[in-house]
């Protein structure tokens, strides 16, 4: 009911009403990432499943080429979880000359790209030092918040190291957004 | 206003309108867990407070026997946090014969049960290796995402080890869902 | 369309309809914290950016003096992430007299203040032991859930140690709420 003043003419309408069921929404789930080249000093973007299993896009929210495309301006709740896993970290090694090591780390960034704006905007970042000794490790980073987006904006999820992402299960690593 | 075409007859209606205040919603909070038998290789489900303190259910969203019962089909945002606490983990012990240890871990799963479907569906999983040395430890796992659910679906929260769940405060461990 | 019975008179109306775009909403982002006195045994509250960059308040949701002021009763989704960072923790030191150390920890609490009620209510808590050896550390705590709030309620974010909060980027530490 987007854009309709949905009332008898004698009533004052402050904003168009619309049914909740027709709002743009998406929940994307992890797939195996194909190793690809990415620009130096730029975190690689994940690609996603958008229609199988738990994944879906609806009401003009489309997924293409690692991006969720925002079809309508408004306030969106955006969320992602990335589960990382890796081998024993070396961050507990003896420090030389009294200097603390730069720790190993894992980072997730939800990024907005606006074609009319030269630089991507980082909306959300979760970053964690990893200092695990004695065994392989695994852990999730979860992010979620509300942002005002414009029609045509594109959203992606970037990670510090694509080779550490746990791509094995759709419930471990995911990305979604919905219009409020 | 569910199911009503809520407009003068000359207007095109794409989907029924409904007031936000009558949508199914619940926020459940932790209670002390009674040790119970559970199937081997199946994580035990938590039970919850549904009406005291911060907890509530409303608009036909009911809680019974560890399950949230979905009263109406639609897209729901589902979330949970479980705070775990435990003693020092042994995962950093010297490895024998060059074999990496299987690390201690904590896991939360939000699971959907559909009576017409034989197997539960894991919607969300947060899993983390625990390798803490020298002291007791505590940490939360948070999950949240949007899913398309059907009337009659049931939701529960399963954990890897019920004895590690911090049940002391309603703000530390909780579970909720609301229709978008 | 708050407060209007928005239908031809022959239809039963269960609750007033309202346009989604006029609901109270806020997303606040981190700023450098001014060291301030706070009561003993009470975690200090963070203050926030409310209009620059990604931050905004709208539809009568106001920010003042570390508080988000709730302008309308209803069910709100409330969320926050705080990224902490610090130096090597000492929690893995040898324990004296066989007693396990009280570990270093980081805690975030989202608190509700109701003027008519003497004590603040802790809505959400994320708390984590920190036991990092050999390097500096950093990590986020994320919280989010739905609560029934009353007009005039005030929300704030408290942390265990304001000096450990990473205030460097608006995507790392944030606080928000929106009426459902």
């Amino acid at each position: 009911l987007k854009g309709q003043e949905f009332a008898p003419s004698h009533q004052q309408v402050y904003a168009p009403l619309r049914a909740d069921g027709d709002k743009p929404r998406a929940h994307l789930t992890v797939v195996r990432q194909t190793p690809t080249q990415h620009f130096k000093n730029q975190f690689p973007a994940l690609h996603w499943e958008h229609e199988l299993g738990l994944a879906f896009t609806k009401n003009r929210m489309n997924y293409t080429n690692k991006f969720l495309l925002i079809p309508e301006s408004g306030d969106y709740f955006i969320y992602s979880q990335v589960t990382f896993r890796g081998m024993t970290s070396e961050c507990s090694e003896i420090r030389q000359a009294g200097r603390p090591n730069k720790p190993d780390s894992i980072t997730v960034v939800i990024t907005k790209v606006t074609d009319s704006y030269p630089e991507p905007t980082q909306l959300l970042m979760g970053t964690k030092s990893v200092c695990e000794v004695g065994s392989n490790w695994f852990q999730p980073i979860y992010l979620g918040a509300m942002f005002s987006l414009q029609e045509g904006d594109k959203l992606m999820v970037n990670v510090s190291d694509i080779s550490l992402v746990d791509y094995t299960k759709e419930d471990k690593t995911f990305f979604g957004a919905f219009l409020l | 206003l569910k199911g009503q075409e809520f407009a003068p007859s000359h207007q095109q209606v794409y989907a029924p309108l409904r007031a936000d205040g009558d949508k199914p919603r619940a926020h459940l909070t932790v209670v002390r867990q009674t040790p119970t038998q559970h199937f081997k290789n199946q994580f035990p489900a938590l039970h919850w407070e549904h009406e005291l303190g911060l907890a509530f259910t409303k608009n036909r969203m009911n809680y019974t026997n560890k399950f949230l019962l979905i009263p109406e089909s639609g897209d729901y945002f589902i979330y949970s946090q479980v705070t775990f606490r435990g003693m020092t983990s042994e995962c950093s012990e010297i490895r024998q014969a060059g074999r990496p240890n299987k690390p201690d871990s904590i896991t939360v799963v939000i699971t959907k049960v559909t009576d017409s479907y034989p197997e539960p569906t894991q919607l969300l999983m947060g899993t983390k290796s625990v390798c803490e040395v020298g002291s007791n430890w505590f940490q939360p796992i948070y999950l949240g995402a949007m899913f398309s659910l059907q009337e009659g679906d049931k939701l529960m929260v399963n954990v890897s080890d019920i004895s590690l769940v911090d049940y002391t405060k309603e703000d530390k461990t909780f579970f909720g869902a609301f229709l978008l | 369309l708050k407060g209007q019975e928005f239908a031809p008179s022959h239809q039963q109306v269960y609750a007033p309809l309202r346009a989604d775009g006029d609901k109270p909403r806020a997303h606040l982002t981190v700023v450098r914290q001014t060291p301030t006195q706070h009561f003993k045994n009470q975690f200090p509250a963070l203050h926030w950016e409310h209009e620059l960059g990604l931050a905004f308040t709208k539809n009568r949701m106001n920010y003042t003096n570390k508080f988000l002021l709730i302008p309308e009763s209803g069910d709100y989704f409330i969320y926050s992430q705080v990224t902490f960072r610090g130096m090597t923790s000492e929690c893995s030191e040898i324990r004296q007299a066989g007693r396990p150390n009280k570990p270093d920890s980081i805690t975030v609490v989202i608190t509700k203040v109701t003027d008519s009620y003497p004590e603040p209510t802790q809505l959400l808590m994320g708390t984590k032991s920190v036991c990092e050896v050999g390097s500096n550390w950093f990590q986020p705590i994320y919280l989010g859930a739905m609560f029934s709030l009353q007009e005039g309620d005030k929300l704030m974010v408290n942390v265990s140690d304001i000096s450990l909060v990473d205030y460097t980027k608006e995507d790392k530490t944030f606080f928000g709420a929106f009426l459902l």
Epitope: T34, T36, Q37, M87, S163, Y167, K169 | - | -
Partner: antibody, heavy 117, light 107 residues
Framework: ELQLQESGPGLVKPSETLSLTCAVS????????WAWIRQPPGKGLEWIGE???????SYNPSLKSRVTVSIDTSKNQFSLKLSSVTAADTAVYFC???????????WGQGTLVTVSS | DIQLTQSPGTLSLSPGERATLSCRAS??????LAWYQQKPGQAPRLLIY???KRATGIPDRFSGSGSGTDFTLTISRLEPEDFAVYYC?????????FGQGTKVEIK
Amino acid sequence: ELQLQESGPGLVKPSETLSLTCAVSGLSFTDFYWAWIRQPPGKGLEWIGEINHKGNTSYNPSLKSRVTVSIDTSKNQFSLKLSSVTAADTAVYFCARDFPNYTFDFWGQGTLVTVSS
Amino acid sequence: DIQLTQSPGTLSLSPGERATLSCRASQSVSNHLAWYQQKPGQAPRLLIYGASKRATGIPDRFSGSGSGTDFTLTISRLEPEDFAVYYCQQYADAPLTFGQGTKVEIK
């Protein structure tokens, strides 16, 4: 402890199909991709392809037209089929666990397959 | 495909000496490079991933460095069990490819 064990015929005739199986024990089968890698005598390593528990596969483009990797989760094993073999396919064939992603931390001991009439 | 060229082909050293092995990629692979050790009649063993991260259980005399196109595996002090063939492997682009190997032999 994780163990991988290759099995299959050691001799295959030219133009026929090479078939190998890798049995996995000691670890959850569902949490990883599982790969086949080969090594011709006295030469380097070549990645053939991989599969996960859902049957999702990826293959080396140089072999893709001849390779099929399949999986049997009920038996915790995965298999390799390489069709239309020639002498150039003579190699030690290894199965391996893909971890961390795209590297291989656990390997079978390898099985030599000779293509000869 | 990305080609990996290892040098030297053979390295003759004595126990206790330092070994420096090189791997050059035909195009940038960022830090997506691993090193393996293989002894005769055995499967390869993962030593290093992410160009510089030691795999679980690998002694700290093994270290990796480099980024982009040029990478080095260093064995700080050769032990008798370190004499073997070493392979690099890139995973920046599909298909995954290996170098031709460097043999470290006893002088």
